[in-house]
């Protein structure tokens, strides 16, 4: 409708690390004369409409979400309307809405992505002595507590992919973080190094494990 | 139970304006969006505009722009739509219908509850 | 303009299972659009049946369901009742202002 109050989010997701804080933008354009007393704003999750913040009655309603969220009382009058949402959690994930209302209303979601980097990987190998080549061993790659869930690529030493016989399970924990626990189980030859990759979709960060198995005694790489 | 009733029929010359009223009753919801929604013989349901009683913010929409007006009386939880300049073709059922700005209950049922109806006839 | 699209008319049986889509000019439909299903039946107001994409109100039997497929925004009765026979209408929220579809003839044979 004509003259409706244009609100204005991101387009594209919000990425915030988990237990950062993360600023949620929106911004309206205020008409000539405007006055905070003018202003009704409503931060809800999009989904249920429950309510997040609120600033209505000329003031500041305070936070409905935890006590975790705060607006930036001194840019209303500008028109940012962008909500900061404190020690960013996985169970935040998701969109919420920014709810304008002055002479006329209007809204706009913004979405939240939550993303936390994987720790390197620990190897381990099963069995883990007196190995021969023709023996199958069983490597296995753990990374822990990422988010979202992790995508995991295993490779040779010459980095051709190793991709039968992998078997990969992933567990939240309390927080809703992820382990992530990768099999390979493979039929060693000569000598040969066996590497794993653990890639964070979000952040696009990668994660590296290698062992290597050089006849007898087997070494794992140092620690970076 | 929160209900809607809404003023009765009404037959208008062209050119003259009608004022409908919508009275919610059996407890209100805070902040709500009151839609007007109208029907003519035949037709489908087509949005008019809508008002936050507890704001006393409305938004029109682009067609009716001009000629409608919604206002609310938030002591008396009505909520009126005028409609002037009024045409042969505005002969329809009105309806006010209940949303939730912010749903309480933490479940937004949308346009849950509306008003009966109010048969308006444009007539020379 | 906004346009949105549903099936003019649908015919089921008892017993069966049908959906209705509400396809939007814009784009995919999404969750921020709200999703609304209205149900009218001859000589009586509109009545919400599912609101925020997928929430049944108050008094609307279970088997009726809310949800978004391939980008559009559907209803589905699953063990259709005789008494469903009615015209049911989307709306989606865009901003600041509900539109309506043209509504689907539900017809039970």
């Known amino acids: 409708p004509t003259g409706a109050v244009e609100v204005q989010v991101p387009e594209d997701p919000v990425v915030a690390l988990v237990g950062t804080d993360a600023t949620l933008r929106c911004s309206f354009s205020p008409e000539p004369g405007f006055s905070l007393a003018q202003l009704n704003l409503i931060w809800q999750l999009t989904d249920t409409k429950q309510l997040v913040h609120s600033f209505t009655e000329g003031r500041d309603q305070g936070s409905a979400y935890a006590n975790r969220t705060a607006l930036f009382p001194d840019l209303l009058a500008q028109g940012n309307a962008s909500l900061r949402l404190q020690r960013v959690r996985v169970a935040d994930e998701g969109s919420f809405t920014c709810f304008v209302s002055i002479r006329d209303f209007g809204s706009a979601a913004v979405s939240l992505q939550v993303a936390a980097p994987y720790s390197k990987p620990s190897m381990t190998l099963e069995p883990n002595k007196d190995l021969r080549p023709g023996d199958t061993v069983t490597i296995t790659c753990s990374s822990y507590r990422g988010y979202p869930e992790a995508e995991v690529f295993w490779q040779d030493g010459q980095g051709v992919p190793l991709t039968g016989n992998v078997t990969t399970s992933q567990m939240a924990n309390e927080q809703g973080l992820f382990d992530v626990h990768s099999v390979l189980r493979v039929v060693l030859g000569a000598n040969g190094t066996y590497s794993c990759l653990v890639r964070n979709p979000v952040l696009q960060q990668d994660a590296h494990g290698s062992v290597t198995i050089t006849g007898q005694p087997m070494t794992f790489p140092p620690e970076a | 139970q929160v209900q809607l009733v809404q003023s009765g029929a009404e037959v208008k010359k062209p050119g003259s304006s009608v004022k409908v009223s919508c009275k919610a009753s059996?407890?209100?919801?805070?902040?709500?969006?009151i839609n007007w929604v109208r029907q003519a013989p035949g037709q489908g349901l087509e949005w008019m505009g809508g008002?936050?009683?507890?704001?006393?913010?409305?938004n029109y929409a682009q067609k009716f722009q001009g000629r409608v007006t919604i206002t609310a009386d938030e002591s008396t939880s009505t909520a009126y739509m005028e409609l002037s300049s009024l045409r042969s073709d505005d002969t329809a059922v009105y309806y006010c219908?209940?949303?939730?700005?912010?749903?309480?209950?933490?479940?937004?049922?949308?346009?849950?509850?509306w008003g009966q109806g109010t048969t308006v006839t444009v007539s020379s | 303009d906004i346009q949105m699209t549903q099936e003019p008319s649908l015919t089921t049986s008892p017993g069966g299972t049908v959906t209705l889509t509400c396809r939007s000019s814009t784009g995919a439909v999404t969750t921020s659009n709200y999703a609304n299903w209205v149900q009218e039946k001859p000589g009586q107001a509109p009545r919400g049946l599912i609101g925020g994409t997928n929430k049944r109100a108050p008094g609307t039997p279970a088997r009726f369901s809310g949800s978004l497929i391939g980008g559009k925004a559907a209803l589905t009765i699953t063990g259709v009742q005789p008494e469903d026979e009615a015209i049911y209408f989307c709306a989606l929220w865009y901003s600041n202002l509900w539109v309506f579809g043209g509504g689907t003839k539900l017809e039970i044979k």
């Open positions: 008002i936050i009683p507890l704001f006393g913010t409305a």
């Open positions: 059996g407890g209100t919801v805070r902040p709500a969006l």
């Open positions: 219908a209940r949303d939730q700005v912010v749903a309480t209950s933490g479940v937004n049922f949308g346009m849950d509850v």
